[in-house]
């Protein structure tokens, strides 16, 4: 083209529809110039115009040749230029924003505006960047791109964003602009212009506010607060924290917290500070629920379901901040609510739900909820297999005769489809605890009954019962102990008896021991005792308890004598013994020696014994008739461990062992013992009978039996020279080589003579007397030999 | 057991001057936050003054501003008010409270002492 | 500076009656810092909540706090006579620090 010719023809479209070329006019024309634009391909179309643009319909693909001619006063000049699709540029129409609001409660802006897509009849694809700026110097803080599609018709466009910073500390700015991407256009794609300027600011009602206020908050995240004030702000603070300042538009200040702490209950305080003022707000940094743990349904009663789980961790959130739990069952639709302020443990929270009618499974979802988000567990259960039934109450205890009794008690509940397996524990007093378990059917009422046999008459009784469903979940809690004593019965036995002929052999004295209480069934009142012979029996007065002895003149005659134990029910079977004792000349007096607590006695087992056997024993050093215990043992045994509270070491008993054979007691043995054998108390008396020039002659004691303390087995005699009241040493001090020592076995010797010795010269005699239990003291003496003749 | 007693009240012709005193026991004086409250006769509570615990910062109603001037000693665990050029409308029984919390800086008052009375008149 | 209303000025009940005590702040606070006080002819005030609806040391159960933003309530639920007295709402979450011009419960 020439020079002074029209240039720079450039051609847009914002529709692909309508395309609007614009050139340059030729330099030096005046106003008043006309063109003639011709667009020539096939075909030749010329237009007649007084602009320096035209808009004509799209074209299709292909070059086309454009001339425009340029007619003014001064002559005309032509330009020619190829026009392609390539050539032309898409720019989209300046986007409108139709409204912009905002949520100053959650500091989120919302954008509105029109695609105006009515005018694009191509489908295509635009993007949106959306451009946010914060305070009046227009700082960028968001630009962000946001697609939609042109499909013919307006379409309305929604947007939001939530702010870092409060939207009340600045003032908050946005524009949008686009840009159509169409696959079909081979023209240039560009950006629009940006959308008129739309603004949010905060009208405040009240001098001077701190933002967010009440806010909850992730623990670990960052947040915003400013101060919206007049006044110059000094200073920030978080708790105890100085915070820099951020200088927002005129004294409005923020704050930025990163990685934020988790708060006490009553929350974190954040204060702003100016020099007549201070403003404060609070921010409560938690947790979400955690998912509810360890969630369990079970009922006490079969009318209410309680839920209980562990909340896990603690949100640190409380009062209307708390975590609220709706605990939703899926077959029924039904639901209840939990709401409370946390307490900081990780107590167990629980539900109460109604059971409903005819409804056994029952599937349970907990929803847990805060300001920070929300968590679910969920349970499927059959309630019938999770009973835990209440404690049982009115635990009664009732006789049903001495050995039998009714136990009672309240379980509250619907149970009229189920069972109960209930465990009584059963306690006698000094004894081992018996647990007795008991299938009974529920019931409607609440109240329940059982009979529990096999007891004891006359027994103090400790009973508590608990109870579990058959298809076992969980025991009840014990219920209250109850004592009971049952009623007495007859005594089973009849009393353990002896007899003993008194020392001038006149009269019988017949022993008896009381019943143990398993026998005597009840308070022993009183006892019977009768002597019969073939002729005759005659009964002694009754003999109230505790006597436990009788005497009775009789001949040497046979005579049964019975002893009957009496209670308040009854009388015992009669404890029979006879008078006679068959005599036995082969006696010899043994010794035995205990262990330390008893004494092992045996014999040889003899047919002939036909009854049983028993060993008598008392303290030999006591008077007769000596009588101090006695044990029955069957007449099948051969041995027999004798013990008693009653036995001390070194004391000398009396043992008898008496056989019964038709009624009679013959003594098999007789034995002098000891439990356990002690050194002798004290040395035996001697006396030097006589002295030559080379002997002494010793003569001693008997020990008394009561100062031996054991079996006498021998004496230790020491001699060896030695003056009274000297230096010299003694007999018996350590290292003397002299010193001769005679031991004497032999526990008849009563003397001895000493030889060899030296005339006129001084010797010291020791004497010690022996047990198997120890060497007993000394007893010494000084004695001198005669001189040599 | 925590306790404030205030003293230094009496009567006082307007334009003069007062120091009120309290004594606070019982607790960590120099870790609590210490504000004065007045209450003029049969009327209600009107708060005067606060200063944090460490003394950083002091705070005034409108109504005493630049008049009053609130200090505390924390060795001697005592709180003043310097009051000057006394009005009237002044006239009141004046209170020392301790705020709740340790240490924070904005709380309520949990323990007051039993008041001093103020009267300004000719 | 932020004003505290409160209704009715008085408010006369029996004894085991229920009492509702209305606090209205002139603008919006933080529920964090409202308290509410009680006090009896010739004695300090004693605090009774704070932060709403947090009951302070030793203060019975009887005693309940509620609300947000600028409405808030102090409930007494069953009227001991020793709970005939002022009651006085406080906000501390902006100086200067102000008081409402109290409630009278008296014996009807």
């Known amino acids: 083209q020439k020079k002074g010719a029209p240039h720079d023809l450039k051609c847009v479209t914002n529709n692909l529809q309508v395309w609007n070329c614009s050139w340059k006019a030729p330099s030096g024309t005046g106003r008043g110039t006309d063109y003639e634009v011709c667009i020539e391909n096939r075909s030749r179309s010329c237009y007649q115009l007084e602009k320096t643009s035209i808009k004509i319909p799209a074209l299709s693909h292909g070059d086309y040749e454009i001339t425009i001619n340029s007619l003014h006063d001064f002559g005309s000049s032509t330009s020619k230029f190829t026009l392609n699709e390539q050539n032309v540029s898409l720019i989209p129409d300046t986007p409108e924003i139709l409204n912009l609001s905002a949520d100053f409660s959650t500091s989120t802006l919302y954008l509105k505006w029109n695609d105006r897509g009515s005018v694009f009849p191509h489908r295509s694809n635009v993007i949106w960047e959306i451009k946010v700026l914060r305070k009046e110097s227009m700082e960028l803080v968001k630009l962000v791109t946001h697609n939609t599609t042109l499909n013919g018709k307006d379409t309305l466009h929604h947007w939001s964003w939530a702010s870092d910073m409060p939207l009340e500390c600045a003032i908050h700015f946005v524009e949008i602009r686009c840009y159509i991407d169409n696959l079909h256009f081979s023209g240039l794609e560009e950006w629009s212009d940006w959308s008129p300027v739309k603004n949010i600011s905060w009208i405040p009602d009240s001098q001077t506010k701190v933002f967010p206020q009440d806010k909850v908050i992730l623990v670990g995240s960052d947040i915003t607060f400013c101060c919206v004030s007049q006044e110059k702000v000094l200073s920030a603070l978080i708790g105890h924290t100085n915070c820099p300042l951020i200088h927002l538009d005129g004294e409005n200040v923020a704050i930025k917290i990163r990685n934020i702490s988790v708060s006490a209950s009553s929350g974190t305080n954040v204060v702003f500070t100016t020099e007549d003022n201070i403003f404060g707000t609070v921010i409560f940094a938690g947790y979400p629920p955690d998912t509810p743990q360890q969630l369990n349904c079970e009922t006490h009663d079969l009318k209410e379901i309680i839920c209980s789980w562990n909340p896990g961790r603690v949100t640190a959130l409380v009062g209307p901040r708390a975590t609220s739990y709706t605990l939703v069952e899926s077959f029924s639709g039904k639901y209840v609510r939990l709401k409370r302020a946390e307490a900081p443990t990780n107590e167990s929270y629980q539900l109460l739900f109604q059971m409903l009618p005819n409804q056994e499974i029952y599937n349970f979802t907990l929803n847990a909820h805060n300001p920070l988000g929300r968590s679910q567990s969920t349970i499927l259960v059959n309630i019938t297999e999770k009973v835990y039934p209440h404690t049982p109450t009115s635990f009664k205890v009732k006789d049903i005769n001495s050995t039998a009794v009714k136990l009672s008690w309240h379980l509250p509940g619907n149970f009229a489809k189920i069972n109960f397996l209930c465990e009584i524990e059963i306690k006698k007093s000094n004894s081992v605890q018996e647990q007795r378990n008991v299938t009974i059917k529920g019931v409607e009422n609440s109240s329940y009954l059982v009979a529990l046999d096999k007891l004891n008459p006359y027994t103090l009784y400790t009973f508590r019962i608990r109870c579990s469903t058959e298809t076992f979940w969980k025991w009840s809690k014990w219920s209250n102990k109850k004592q009971h004593l049952t009623t007495e019965a007859s005594p089973s036995k009849g009393p353990d008896t002896w007899r003993e002929w008194s020392s001038d052999g006149k009269n019988l004295i017949i022993y008896w021991k009381p019943l143990p209480i398993n026998e005597a069934n009840g308070k022993i009142l009183s006892y019977n005792v009768s002597c019969s012979s073939d002729e005759e029996t005659q009964s002694l007065s009754e003999i109230p308890d505790p006597q436990h002895k009788a005497e009775i003149r009789l001949d040497k005659n046979d005579y049964i004598i019975s002893v009957v134990a009496k209670n308040s029910v009854g009388s015992s079977p009669p404890s029979k013994i006879a008078s006679m004792e068959i005599p036995n000349d082969d006696l010899k007096i043994e010794q035995v020696v205990g262990m330390g607590k008893g004494i092992l006695l045996t014999w040889h087992y003899d047919p002939n014994m036909t009854c049983d056997y028993v060993i008598k024993w008392c303290n030999s050093s006591r008077s007769e008739p000596c009588l101090m215990d006695w044990r029955k043992v069957p007449s099948n045994s051969t041995e027999t461990v004798i013990e008693s509270d009653e036995f001390r070491p070194g004391i000398r008993y009396n043992f008898f062992l008496y056989g019964c054979r038709n009624q009679g007691y013959q003594l098999l043995r007789s034995m002098i013992g000891y439990i356990e054998e002690l050194a002798p108390i004290v040395a035996p008396n001697f006396t030097v009978e006589d002295t030559s020039a080379d002997s002494i002659l010793v003569k001693w004691e008997d020990i008394p039996v009561e100062e031996l303390r054991g079996f006498l087995r021998g004496y230790l005699f020491y001699f060896g020279k030695g003056e009274r009241d000297t230096s010299k040493m003694r007999v018996l001090e350590s290292g003397r080589s002299d010193i001769k020592v005679k031991n004497i076995t032999d526990i008849s010797q009563k003397t001895l003579r000493i030889a060899d010795l030296q005339g006129k010269t001084s010797y010291h005699l020791v004497l010690r007397a022996y047990t198997d239990g120890g060497v007993g003291p000394e007893k010494s003496m000084y004695v001198v030999t005669k001189e040599n003749s | 057991q925590v306790q404030l007693v205030e003293s230094g009240g009496g009567v006082v012709q307007p334009g003069r001057s007062l120091r009120l005193s309290c004594a606070a026991s019982?607790?960590?004086?120099?870790?609590?936050?210490m504000d004065w409250v007045r209450q003029a006769p049969g009327k209600g509570l009107e708060w005067v003054a606060v200063?944090?615990?460490?003394?950083?910062?002091?705070y005034y109603a409108d109504s005493v501003k630049g008049r009053f001037t609130i200090s505390r000693d924390n060795s001697k665990n005592t709180l003043y008010l310097q009051m000057n050029s006394l009005r009237a409308e002044d006239t009141a029984v004046y209170y020392c409270?301790?705020?709740?919390?340790?240490?924070?800086?904005?709380?309520?008052?949990?323990?007051w002492g039993q008041g001093t009375l103020v009267t300004v008149s000719s | 500076k932020i004003v505290l209303t409160q209704s009715p000025g008085t408010l006369s009940l029996s004894p085991g009656g229920r009492a509702t005590l209305s606090c209205r702040a002139s603008?919006?606070?933080?529920?964090?810092?409202l308290a509410w006080y009680q006090q009896k002819p010739g004695q300090a005030p004693r605090l009774l909540i704070y932060?709403?609806?947090n009951r302070a040391t030793g203060i019975p159960d009887r005693f309940s706090g509620s609300g947000s933003g600028t409405d808030f309530t102090l409930t007494i639920s069953r009227l001991e006579p020793e709970d005939f007295a002022v009651y006085y709402c406080?906000?501390?979450?902006?100086?200067?620090?102000?008081f409402g011009p109290g409630i009278k419960v008296d014996i009807k």
């Open positions: 603008q919006s606070i933080s529920s964090s810092y």
């Open positions: 019982g607790f960590t004086f120099s870790s609590y936050g």
């Open positions: 200063i944090w615990y460490d003394g950083s910062n002091k």
């Open positions: 406080q906000q501390y979450g902006s100086s200067p620090f102000t």
């Open positions: 932060a709403a609806s």
């Open positions: 409270a301790r705020e709740l919390w340790f240490g924070e800086l904005l709380s309520p008052f949990d323990f």
